[in-house]
């Protein structure tokens, strides 16, 4: 708390300007009117106040707006935003994308802080869904943003927003998240032709079911090994050797280097050795010739 002291004669601030730069903490508290500060917040950023001075300015705004700042003030907070606590931010009602961008710009170069996470949460909840413009903005500032959401939160992402997603935005997503995003991406890109569709859908394929992978294998897509290794194991297992060969195209040779890793390892164990041999890659571990393969899961389903 800053002690209440009278403003020295001639030091009362008539406007927020650079003359305040060397005011001490108590002088700022005594000589700057909170209402004046609120109407001239945009000027604060143009003055290199120290963090100690910014603390005093925040204190003045807190006293003026105990229920939370209006958006007209929030939009111009600048470095004062870094002084806000998540509790402060929970009192705000941020509806403008411009306000969100202004505050994210301040935090640029920092990790996503609890303040930013709270701000985004308030903003998205206020909008009701994660629309394309918001997603565009958030992933521009935080490429990993999408993968920080729970599958439940991701379910509110409309398919139209998927167009804003870049491959790097999905780098840290786990299979449960891709399970939610993949059907949305499939819907979003459904009107594209084969090769263009594959380019767009490729990053989301970690959520693709077997039947979609089979369909892709008929389209000469030449999937790279990095994408193949991110596919769901349960989706890869039912694929035949011929289908995997078509799916990977010239990249099929990369299977040898990955034969000890999932999903390749598990897939090999499900294939006939004869069929694996047709690839000429020396893949070992398939089902020996003459062995009968019983799909017990299918038998259980029938009974």
């Amino acid at each position: 708390e800053v002690e209440k002291t009278a403003c020295p004669s001639g030091k009362k601030a008539r406007e927020i300007d650079e003359s305040l730069i060397f005011y001490k903490k108590w002088e700022l508290e005594a000589c700057v009117d909170a209402a004046l500060l609120a109407t001239q917040m945009d000027r604060v950023n143009a003055i290199p106040f120290t963090y100690e001075q910014l603390d005093v300015l925040k204190h003045k705004l807190d006293e003026l707006y105990p229920q939370g700042y209006p958006e007209s003030v929030i939009q111009h907070l600048g470095y004062l935003f870094l002084k806000m606590s998540p509790e402060d931010i929970r009192k705000w009602n941020v509806t403008s994308l411009e306000t969100l961008k202004a505050l994210l710009e301040v935090n640029k170069g920092h990790e996503m802080s609890p303040q930013v996470a709270t701000l985004i949460d308030r903003f998205v909840k206020g909008r009701g869904q994660l629309d394309k413009d918001t997603l565009d903005t958030l992933t521009a500032f935080y490429p990993g943003y999408l993968c920080s959401l729970s599958p439940e939160e991701l379910s509110s992402v409309p398919p139209s927003s998927i167009w804003a997603v870049r491959p790097q935005d999905l780098d840290t997503c786990d299979p449960r998240q891709l399970d939610v995003l993949y059907p949305k991406a499939r819907l979003a890109f459904q009107n594209m032709n084969g090769s263009e569709y594959f380019v767009k859908i490729q990053s989301f394929l970690g959520g693709a079911p077997t039947e979609d992978l089979k369909a892709l294998s008929q389209q000469n897509v030449s999937m790279d090994l990095a994408t193949f290794m991110k596919l769901r194991t349960d989706a890869v297992l039912p694929l035949t050797v011929a289908e995997v060969q078509k799916l990977l195209g010239p990249h099929v040779e990369g299977l040898k280097a990955e034969e000890r890793h999932r999903p390749v390892r598990d897939w090999i164990l499900r294939q006939r050795q004869d069929d694996l041999d047709t690839l000429g890659l020396g893949l070992q571990g398939g089902i020996p010739n003459g062995y009968l393969v019983l799909d017990l899961s299918m038998q259980e389903a029938l009974s």
């Epitope: 650079e18 003359s19 730069i21 060397f22 945009d42 950023n45 143009a46 003055i47 290199p48 106040f49 120290t50 963090y51 100690e52 001075q53 603390d55 600048g78 470095y79 870094l82 301040v106 640029k108 170069g109 920092h110």
Partner: antibody, heavy 123, light 106 residues
């Protein structure tokens, strides 16, 4: 490309005067708060003086108050330091430095520096 | 506010992980910057807000800390990193610098 070029340094006797200049280019000089920072031989950095973008607000370190005067000419993209009553302890490399801006934000940091000019006060 | 850097000098080899500390005489939140100065050259801003990398600065440089204790870390020392490093506080005026840490070749 941002450039700050200091000039005016040299050898001066105790009690003498010097005027340092700093020519700025490659950025909007009138937007920036500017500083003089000095470094005595083999020593650390000391913030000497500060002038706001318009020139209306000025700061001096206690060690130079009353002897040094900072000024700027935004039309000429130039910063100046008039040094009077010089003492042996004023011997140092004097750097001109701009404040830090990432539009629209400013922090009291030093973003761009000149190469410095040496001031030697000795009899 | 006084800033005390330690060590005042250190010897290290290329590839080493180097850590420099800066202690403030009172709490300064995250209002700390780090500069690099090579012999005969002007200082260069590396980090501000205790941990934010200035644009164009290699990611091997990182900063941490808050309050009174701060650290500059160079994850894998490169030949061009041999220099003197200074911390600066911008929590309150007058702005002050630490005494510097010279990083020399072992």
């Amino acid at each position: 490309q941002v450039q700050l070029v200091e000039s005016g340094g040299g050898l001066v006797k105790p009690g003498g005067s010097l005027r340092l200049s700093c020519a700025a280019s490659g950025f909007t000089f009138s937007d920036y708060y500017m500083s003089w920072i000095r470094q005595a031989p083999g020593k650390g950095l000391e913030w000497v003086s500060y002038i706001s973008s318009s020139g209306s607000t000025i700061y001096y370190a206690d060690s130079v108050k009353g002897r040094f005067t900072i000024s700027r000419d935004n039309a000429k993209n130039s910063l100046y330091l008039q040094m009077n009553s010089l003492r042996a302890e004023d011997t140092a490399v004097y750097y001109c430095a701009s404040g830090w801006i990432r539009v629209p934000l400013r922090l009291p940091l030093f973003q761009h520096w000149g190469q410095g000019t040496l001031v030697t006060v000795s009899s | 506010i006084q800033l005390t850097q330690s060590p005042s000098s250190l010897s290290a080899s290329v590839g080493d992980r180097v850590t420099i500390t800066c202690r403030a005489s009172q709490g300064i939140s995250s209002a700390l910057a780090w500069y690099q100065q090579k012999p005969g050259k002007a200082p260069k801003l590396l980090i501000y807000d205790a941990s934010s990398l200035e644009s164009g600065v290699p990611s091997r440089f990182s900063g941490s800390g808050s309050g009174t204790d701060f650290t500059l870390t160079i994850s894998s020392l490169q030949p061009e990193d041999f220099a003197t490093y200074y911390c600066q506080q911008f929590n309150s005026y007058p702005l002050t610098f630490g005494g510097g840490t010279k990083v020399e070749i072992k």
